[in-house]
Amino acid sequence: QPPPPPPDATCHQVRSFFQRLQPGLKWVPETPVPGSDLQVCLPKGPTCCSRKMEEKYQLTARLNMEQLLQSASMELKFLIIQNAAVFQEAFEIVVRHAKNYTNAMFKNNYPSLTPQAFEFVGEFFTDVSLYILGSDINVDDMVNELFDSLFPVIYTQLMNPGLPDSALDINECLRGARRDLKVFGNFPKLIMTQVSKSLQVTRIFLQALNLGIEVINTTDHLKFSKDCGRMLTRMWYCSYCQGLMMVKPCGGYCNVVMQGCMAGVVEIDKYWREYILSLEELVNGMYRIYDMENVLLGLFSTIHDSIQYVQKNAGKLTTTIGKLCAHSQQRQYR
Amino acid sequence: SAYYPEDLFIDKKVLKVAHVEHEETLSSRRRELIQKLKSFISFYSALPGYICSHSPVAENDTLCWNGQELVERYSQKAARNGMKNQFNLHELKMKGPEPVVSQIIDKLKHINQLLRTMSMPKGRVLDKNLDEEGFESGDCGDDEDECIGGSGDGMIKVKNQLRFLAELAYDLDVDDAPGNSQQATPKDNEISTFHN
């Protein structure tokens, strides 16, 4: 480091150092002045600082602080932003694969049910995607709609393929019968349980990551108070007013000042810790029916089983439905 | 063995795909994220110290600035500074957080509540409210596959996590469902999303 300079009788060095921040020299005294108007860098004797310089220092100090805070949170912010994007995309890919699995199952096992089945499956998985992204959709309704839509097609194409076209307006009756007669057994209930649990967890996981980003963004763009600006100015710049161009703040002093400036921000700490630990707990529980990947990629199989269940009970069901929906059919013939 | 759509195909064509080593799974990615986040658990309480360590402070110098004068770095005066005529540091701390900070704390409290509610106790077995005909779900083995429910044909196992990306060399579009084609489609590049 350079040797300590002799006292400056002309404010020459202060002028040059101030030019690092502010081009031009009109704010810097030619020679030391009493500085009675200073509010932050209170002089013990003549000073080379003016009120205007103090104001510039305070403004710069607060900007410095904002930049320091942003650089401190950069890595954390990037971590959460990147992962939120990756997981959102991953979940979308899982949904797309689950839809394709289900469509492939229909195409290869029940070709007569396509293309209607594709349409219902597509609508179901669109709702799944929307739900994950926070849409106000009821999962039970989504599952019910899928089975309500599928059953009339299964009944008319698989169970009763000889049904005349004129009788095809019994759909409403068939939709009602689907629930009343538990046509698919407990499979819809099973799917509801699994899908709702896995999607709820997925949705809250994404919500939590997005809130994490919001927390960092909020603290990243905090505007520091004037009091804080004064404390920082005194720590970083007031030494210049005394011609001390090379000294650095004491470590303990810096900590005291930063704790004062950060008092509000540090209050987040308790809740931030809890956030990370709660998120960890959630992640630890994301398996089996709490893992949407596991659940959605197995849906085709459960749906396949549910259709087999219907086929197994086809004889009994056809008779019952024949009676139950006879009125609808008769109405069509008139 | 995993129960996959290709097992259901009428022509029973089964796609053979080379085993992909070290494939990244969603589950492992989640755990990795948590581990990284945990290294930031003290982020807010450590901020004042972090900022001091990234701004100029006297380390090797004998003398340092305490806001009023040059002092010996290890003297009592080094941390005690002349703030009394200026503004009270205690008052500054007592002012409480800004409204935006209070709002974000409320949001954190809310999400923490939700996360706690959603967190499931470990090792919980699946709901057994299945079919009247006695369909039941039992526990799966300790292998990496997880069961998602049962059927008359026995336990359905689904390959857990994004292994399906490795084992299916293409997107199962209806137009090129397995059986119709065994070619990889350009959509494969989306798989790389899950790798660092």
Epitope: L63, L68, Y237, S239 | -
Partner: nanobody, 120 residues
């Protein structure tokens, strides 16, 4: 550990030119703003010039504007000060200094300096 080593100083006649270099190591040079500071014999420190990490932004004290040019080569981790039309009052020890993240605040690190003497 951070090291800044200046070189290129010497005796030069008024009106002459010199190019100072500062070799940096121990930190990410390309992301650090750098400054040149000088100290004339028996005088205080005077800030001379600064340059941003990318080299895209420069700043000079009024007394050297138009005569001195600061530049950097991030691939070589080196800072330069091209001094033209030198005057007797430019005689000083020239230090290169690493700027801290506090703009206009105390420097993080200094070199040991190189002496420039302008005399006929």
């Amino acid at each position: 550990q951070v090291q800044l080593v200046e070189s290129g100083g010497g005796l030069v006649q008024p009106g002459g030119s010199l190019r100072l270099s500062c070799a940096a190591s121990g930190f990410t040079f390309s992301s650090s703003a750098m400054s040149w500071v000088r100290q004339a014999p028996g005088k205080g420190l005077e800030w001379v010039s600064a340059i941003s990490g990318s080299g895209g932004s420069t700043n000079y004290v009024d007394s050297v504007k138009g005569r001195f040019t600061v530049s950097r080569d991030n691939s070589k981790n080196t800072l330069y000060l091209q001094m033209n039309r030198l005057r007797a009052e430019d005689t000083a020890v020239y230090y290169c200094a690493k700027e801290s993240m506090v703009r206009g605040g105390p420097f993080d690190y200094w070199g040991q300096g190189t002496l420039v003497t302008v005399s006929s």
